[in-house]
């Protein structure tokens, strides 16, 4: 996570700000969103458990060309671990289930808005 | 227009059981957090506890862990108290909360409580 | 558990005085996430509560700009400016920092 403030950040960033700042790119997306996100683009769901940074990473890089997701999948990349990219996928994609890009920020920012209340960062 | 509408209140023998209902209306609960308080005749506010019912993540007050079961059911947007073992002390007016939708920073709606009665 | 000790726990005040009333927390409630969880809610007789504070100092939307909340750390307060005749009722400070959630006991302010 030390990473996530970019080069001129004076230190590292601590877990609940980086956090904090990956929910306010999600609200930004979902509440300027007028045309259809990122084209309508189908992502494959993930399950919210544990590494699920990696798995939303491994979903939204597969689409492209679409900048409005760009910053959040850096974003993402900061809380991931290891080095994703396109055609990777963890056994945490519910592979069965395509969901719109929409749909999955939205869901997306459910789930880290309640981690962020309840003080998981990692 | 939220709504939250408690109901199951009544009368209760010492040791017998009963289950509270709360009805969501005007949002989806799976997008907060609902919580219990009490408060018994003439008394203050005490937190009973709190559930996600995106993920049954239910947290309780030590002192109502295992006599209390908080619960939900998303198709019918209802959250659920169910109390046993209920005692003399347990007598109060119970309402659900819920978490404010944006960042879950406090309770903005209340339903109007449901009183229970423990006697004999 | 963290205690939340409300002072006094009921005054008399007449219509138009300034009315202040202290909450202090046996421990800090600064969460891990760096918000202070500390609300102030206003209940009358046979109602629910209604929140006014949230936040130690950010006044709910609707709330009347007679009141204000302030503190840090431990010690927090609800300050109403000037007391209006619709201000009598109970006031009950309340941390959502750590679970179990705690209120504070209640403040009954009462017509002198």
């Known amino acids: 996570l030390t990473c996530l403030g970019g080069f001129a950040s004076p230190g590292p960033v601590p877990p609940s700000t980086a956090l904090r700042e990956l929910i306010e790119e999600l609200v930004n997306i979902t509440q300027n969103q007028k045309a259809p996100l990122c084209n309508g683009s189908m992502v494959w769901s993930i399950n919210l458990t544990a590494g699920m940074y990696c798995a939303a990473l491994e979903s939204l890089i597969n689409v492209s060309g679409c900048s409005a997701i760009e910053k959040t999948q850096r974003m993402l990349s900061g809380f991931c671990p290891h080095k994703v990219s396109a055609g990777q996928f963890s056994s945490l994609h519910v592979r069965d289930t395509k969901i719109e890009v929409a749909q999955f920020v939205k869901d997306l920012l459910l789930h880290l808005k309640k981690l962020f209340r309840e003080g998981q960062f990692n | 227009e939220v709504q939250l509408v408690e109901s199951g209140g009544g009368l209760v023998q010492p040791g017998g059981s009963l289950r509270l209902s709360c009805a969501a209306s005007g949002f989806n609960i799976k997008d907060t957090y609902i919580h219990w308080v009490r408060q018994a005749p003439g008394k203050g506010l005490e937190w009973v506890g709190r559930i996600d019912p995106a993920n049954d993540n239910i947290k309780y007050d030590p002192k109502f862990q295992g006599r209390f079961t908080i619960s939900a059911d998303n198709a019918k947007n209802s959250l659920y108290l169910q109390m046993n073992s209920l005692r003399a002390e347990d007598t109060a007016v119970y309402y659900c909360?819920?978490?404010?939708?944006?960042?879950?920073?406090?309770?903005?709606?209340w339903g109007q409580g449901t009183l229970v009665t423990v006697s004999s | 558990d963290i205690q939340m000790t409300q002072s006094p726990s009921s005054l008399s005040a007449s219509v138009g005085d300034r009315v202040t009333i202290t909450c202090r927390s046996s421990q800090s409630i600064v969460h891990s996430n760096g918000n202070t969880y500390l609300e102030w809610y206003q209940q009358k007789p046979g109602k629910a509560p209604k929140l006014l504070i949230y936040k130690v100092s950010n006044r709910f939307s609707g709330v009347p700009s007679r009141f204000s909340g302030s503190g840090s750390g431990t010690d927090f307060t609800l300050t109403i400016s000037s007391l209006q005749p619709e201000d009598f009722a109970t006031y009950y400070c309340?941390?959502?920092?750590?679970?179990?959630?705690?209120f504070g006991g209640g403040t009954k302010v009462e017509i002198k």
């Open positions: 309340f941390q959502g920092s750590h679970i179990p959630y705690t």
């Open positions: 909360a819920r978490s404010e939708e944006n960042w879950y920073d406090f309770f903005d709606y």
